[in-house]
Amino acid sequence: EKLPKAPVITTPLETVDALVEEVATFMCAVESYPQPEISWTRNKILIKLFDTRYSIRENGQLLTILSVEDSDDGIYCCIANNGVGGAVESCGALQVKMKPKITRPPINVKIIEGLKAVLPCTTMGNPKPSVSWIKGDNALRENSRIAVLESGSLRIHNVQKEDAGQYRCVAKNSLGTAYSKLVKLEVEVFARILRAPESHNVTFGSFVTLRCTAIGIPVPTISWIENGNAVSSGSIQESVKDRVIDSRLQLFITKPGLYTCIATNKHGEKFSTAKAAATVSIAEWSKSQKDSQGYCAQYRGEVCDAVLAKDALVFFNTSYRDPEDAQELLIHTAWNELKAVSPLCRPAAEALLCNHLFQECSPGVVPTPMPICREYCLAVKELFCAKEWQAMEGKAHRGLYRSGMHLLPVPECSKLPSMHRDPTACTRLPYLDYKKENITTFPSITSSRPSADIPNLPASTSSFAVSPAYSMT
């Protein structure tokens, strides 16, 4: 009769490497008497004998995983017990090896020049695949703008036209290589004017050709505006070459005017626009124009763009050496000061300052600026900006200048024309409901009985837009 003998595992489990969909086997040789009962666990969870993914043979000493899956990774243990002494166990790891697989391939991208582009490339594999990118036929080199992220995605900062092309990502490990399909990166470029039309001073009845050249991707379209309206006469010729559009407007000159070339292209649902303007003046008129100390031109600055009427002509004072730059600098300084004022005051003050520095202009024989109406000026100073004004005046009296408004080029209200006198003599300012609950509009009121200085309120003559969010008439 054999003596009872506690189980001993004679071949301890070892780490097993297996490829996905291949077979993996763990061997657990046991010596004991009587014969032991052998059970298997994966990550400390018992493997059931009837689980069809496994085959257990040789009295339980052989565990076979019939088709390895990614999720089979883990620690496998065999436990032998025959009732003599304690149970014994041996454990080994299963490392599932996997050829590279691209789980989120890149897709075609359209991106605006200067923005950031990210082409995804998410991979799986064991060992973890390394990801590289190919542009056209060549390996892509990383630089300060172009980087392959930890995730495998390709990030391009400040996208340039030359970044356009075909891209694919490559995932590689010791078991193999995977390639994504080719994707296209298209770089769109905002419309930009390469050659602005030139101003002309000609004799009455002359022909003038204004030329405007623009570039962009997609190729822009060019339209022409005369004194704020679509060009009513003249002929336009266009040609396109290498994403550059060239437009020529031929005019028969019978009156002076401001001609604006507008280049537009579309990016998805949005449009980009570039503008350039030129004046056409009639030679005999130039003396009286000089006498007016200024000229009418479209506002081309940035600060007051949202406040002034779209395509409005504004007055530029030629007592400055460079009127457009000088006036823009003044408003820019003022704008920074306005950061210190209350939200109630700011939109009103912005409207006042922009319309004071860039007064609406009638481009007749003598360009005439139209000042703000005194009533609106008063309302900004004494109602919307009352606190700021008191603070400013108090500090001015004491020789101190620390208020948020002391540098502002503000008009003296009392010197402005009253809107009660002549509807065409002054500009109405738009006022916002300060709670911003609704858009406030100014009505048209017809004068019924004129009086020396103060008849009924005139009809509104100016249309302004205060900000992208508000419009008023």
């Epitope: 309302a379 004494e382 109602l383 409901d433 300060y434 009505p443 020396a452 309120l457």
Partner: antibody, heavy 117, light 107 residues
């Protein structure tokens, strides 16, 4: 600080005239328009007219046209409101007020004019 | 002339109540409307300018709204010092015109 000081109470007979003054101080007199508003006993406010102290131009409510005259004296920063052909229904407190709708809110203390026979 | 109709002419309310006074213009006056408060024997005091602007120094329980022909003055929670007569004024065109007034009394 801004002050509008009006002349004292007046008692007048029907058919007579009254001239109420409003002396301004604490600001540049010619920079702001002046309104005249009246209030009969137990009644509401009634706008009478406006004067521009800079040029002396005026505008009057139709109801008072021909009976009211608004003037100013820039040397003393004073505006005047004269109402003629007084009737008993002209018994009221008369106020001067600076820039009623547009600028800061400043009113005189009021002048009581009583018209009775 | 533009007529201004205020309603109600008189009303009584209790401390803490929410009170609304309306002013209707006979024609569009945009937002050129001011609200005044007057206490017996005192000078009128402007509460609201340009329909919804709260005059400096006026408690935030007062608010104004509206544009065109319909305007509202609201006192969110009535205080003892709010019992007075309230007037609207249109300054859209001459002659300026006041509403007939709303007398707010204690209930």
């Amino acid at each position: 600080q801004v002050q509008l000081v009006q002349s004292g109470a007046e008692e007048k007979k029907p058919g007579a005239s009254v001239k109420v003054s409003c002396k301004a101080s604490g600001y540049t007199f010619t920079n702001y328009y002046m309104h005249w508003v009246r209030q009969a006993p137990g009644q509401g406010l009634e706008w009478m007219g406006i004067i521009n102290p800079s040029g002396g131009n005026t505008s009057y409510a139709q109801k008072f046209q021909g009976r009211v005259t608004m003037t100013r004296d820039t040397s003393t920063s004073t505006v005047y409101m004269e109402l003629s052909s007084l009737r008993s229904e002209d018994t009221a407190v008369y106020y001067c007020a600076r820039e009623l709708g547009w600028g800061s809110d400043y009113w005189g203390q009021g002048t009581l004019v009583t018209v009775s026979s | 002339d533009i007529q201004m109709t205020q309603s109600p002419s008189a009303m009584s309310a209790s401390i803490g109540d929410r009170v609304t006074i309306t002013c209707r213009a006979s024609q569009d006056i945009s937002n050129y409307l001011a609200w005044f408060q007057q206490k017996p024997g005192k000078v009128p005091k402007r509460l609201i300018y340009v329909a919804s602007g709260l005059q400096s120094g006026v408690p935030s329980r007062f608010s104004g709204s509206g544009s065109g022909t319909e305007f509202t003055l609201t006192i969110s929670s009535l205080q003892p010092e709010d019992f007075a007569t309230y007037y609207c004024l249109q300054h859209n065109s001459y002659p300026f015109t006041f509403g007939q007034g709303t007398k707010l009394e204690i209930k």
